[in-house]
Amino acid sequence: SIPWNLERITPPRYRADEYQPPDGGSLVEVYLLDTSIQSDHREIEGRVMVTDFENVPEEDGTRFHRQASKCDSHGTHLAGVVSGRDAGVAKGASMRSLRVLNCQGKGTVSGTLIGLEFIRKSQLVQPVGPLVVLLPLAGGYSRVLNAACQRLARAGVVLVTAAGNFRDDACLYSPASAPEVITVGATNAQDQPVTLGTLGTNFGRCVDLFAPGEDIIGASSDCSTCFVSQSGTSQAAAHVAGIAAMMLSAEPELTLAELRQRLIHFSAKDVINEAWFPEDQRVLTPNLVAALPPSTHGAGWQLFCRTVWSAHSGPTRMATAVARCAPDEELLSCSSFSRSGKRRGERMEAQGGKLVCRAHNAFGGEGVYAIARCCLLPQANCSVHTAPPAEASMGTRVHCHQQGHVLTGCSSHWEVEDLGTHKPPVLRPRGQPNQCVGHREASIHASCCHAPGLECKVKEHGIPAPQEQVTVACEEGWTLTGCSALPGTSHVLGAYAVDNTCVVRSRDVSTTGSTSEGAVTAVAICCRSRHLAQASQELQ
């Protein structure tokens, strides 16, 4: 019967006793940077070309015996997971292997850098179709390795990497911490994070998504028909490399940003038990398990958005945190979050010709996060409209006044340490959804966008009594672009988007009285693109 991991990534409409997805990734070449491999294993023979690239350190220890089957173990298994005839994800994908890890599974930053350069040169000499580079390795944070990954990604190559097996923040490792790389954590058959001895999968904001990574059956270098079960984020990354190969084979023109958004969109949502992660990492870690799209075509009509968390600002009074979207993405809204609740809001600002989301810490605060909502919106023209503090009792307002521009997000930022928390909440006048409303002492920022066929609406959910969390979701066919809290609620820790749901977090109810200022209102801005929908219908 079908191995659990292949069943897990397969949408129900394709499920059968055998894993037979519609397209095997035949237009895509996957580069594997790993150990040596046993290329004559019948699972991968004829599918994997062993390049002459080898850059590995000497094995440690005088008593180390180099045994071929052991040297090839990791790479052979991963090649099988990506494109193996029997237990592979992308059965049609061809692979090229580069040896950057020695027989003990160790490599160097320099060896990996030279390997990436080898790929870049190969691409220039003989351009082929879409390229996926699988980096099933993790080392300490390396600015130079991350920069090399960025260069290759900007040349149109999709890089997929393991989050690492250290039960730690993936942002502390490379290439996992490189924003341009698709970073993959590992889950098991119960959709729980993988534990590996005393350690386990890495987590945090640098992880893009999770994928099967425990008891993964694949080619064993022991013999030509041998199979073995292996576990780790390398195996998880191999699944995503295979899924990416299949998506790119179906739609070869996909950009890295489009591919990443699709991987996120088609993932299984909210199935991971977050209690496994350290408490401070739960909100930052995506609750997503990779899956193949239900159809390899026809996703183009959707407005895709994802949430990008910044690094923590640190606790100093004037500390700020910045969240950025990828080059091909539009920043449609900006929000902030602080565990202590002491923050001075957030604003969208231009940096290097692109909008970024900046969150501000407050005096006595433990630090803030900026949260960007990054979307794929072709032909978009977005700008930020700001209203300074009004000082009037009605609060501060700003709206999108340009013809054809719609509101996609609201942010508010204040200079004062205390916003006058005992003021009653400001209510948005009915019939004026295209405006942002904020506290009278705050400056308000409206993200206003014009794009063909773009329409947006505001959806609110208010709870009169204090709650630790208030949510509001966009309905089917609409995509969440903006998430904020209505002003006047003193105990709000911040707002952020989780998939298509806007979450407003408040301080522990026990520390807040159930007085009128305990009311919390979550405000979601939901958008869709009629233009994208029409365009995809024309293509079919």
Partner: antibody
Framework: QVQLVQSGAEVKKPGESLKISCKGS????????ISWVRQMPGKGLEWMGM????????SYNPKFQGQVTISADKSISTAYLQWSSLKASDTAMYYC????????????WGQGTLVTVSS | DIVMTQSPDSLAVSLGERATINCRSS????????????LAWYQQKPGQPPKLLIY???TRESGVPDRFSGSGSGTDFTLTISSLQAEDVAVYYC?????????FGQGTKVEIK
């Protein structure tokens, strides 16, 4: 039920070409390997080679490489063994058998095709 | 290539008696990754194709009578018929399926004494 059905016996002259077949049914043909095994009169079993119908990957016993060609047509769940120029020494019973990555032994065999090459 | 050698070439046993066939491989077919021996036993009766009896050296195929058992590990293996029946008259082959080319033993003919 799961079965492999082979084409009928053949009598040929040396130098002639021949293609014998093995049709799979009752299972997912593209997800199993098909091997061909030779048994010369009164002798033992010799593995000739195999094919994976899913992508037509083949692997041959060096002893038979270049002597025979293994192919498959997955649309009709059929594997083939062919000779371009038969020799008297090709006289034998030929069996097809299937195996799977999780069961790499031959669990199902065809009934055999007797090939006689004589002038 | 892995060479498979069976002994004896032929064997005559009385009905109800034990028949033992040995098979030796020129290199180990036991693999540490899954701790399995990549060895099978087949039975071939006159005019019929071979039939799978035992796989992974000791696992009986479904439908095979429990008088057939396989044992051994690494390079030395044994097929035992605990109580020979008339219908067990056949040629028995061992086979390694770990590396290519796949190879069979030369066969052992079992007859009734």
């Amino acid at each position: 039920q799961v079965q492999l059905v082979q084409s009928g016996a053949e009598v040929k002259k040396p130098g002639e070409s021949l293609k014998i077949s093995c049709k799979g049914s009752g299972y997912s043909f593209t997800n199993y390997y098909i091997s061909w095994v030779r048994q010369m009169p009164g002798k033992g079993l010799e593995w000739m080679g195999m094919i994976y119908p899913g992508d037509s990957y083949t692997s041959y016993n060096p002893k038979f490489q270049g002597q025979v060609t293994i192919s498959a047509d997955k649309s009709i769940s059929t594997a083939y063994l062919q000779w371009s120029s038969l020799k008297a020494s090709d006289t034998a019973m030929y069996y097809c058998a299937r195996d799977h990555w999780s069961k790499p032994y031959f669990d199902i065999w065809g009934q055999g095709t007797l090939v006689t090459v004589s002038s | 290539d892995i060479v498979m050698t069976q002994s004896p070439d032929s064997l005559a046993v009385s009905l109800g008696e034990r028949a033992t066939i040995n098979c030796r491989s020129s290199q180990s077919v036991l693999y540490s990754s899954n701790n399995k021996n990549y060895l099978a036993w087949y039975q071939q009766k006159p005019g019929q194709p071979p039939k799978l009896l035992i796989y992974w050296a000791s696992t009986r195929e479904s439908g095979v009578p429990d008088r057939f058992s396989g044992s051994g590990s690494g390079t030395d293996f044994t097929l035992t018929i605990s109580s020979l029946q008339a219908e067990d008259v056949a040629v028995y082959y061992c086979q390694q399926y770990s590396s290519f080319p796949i190879t069979f033993g030369q066969g052992t003919k079992v007859e009734i004494k």
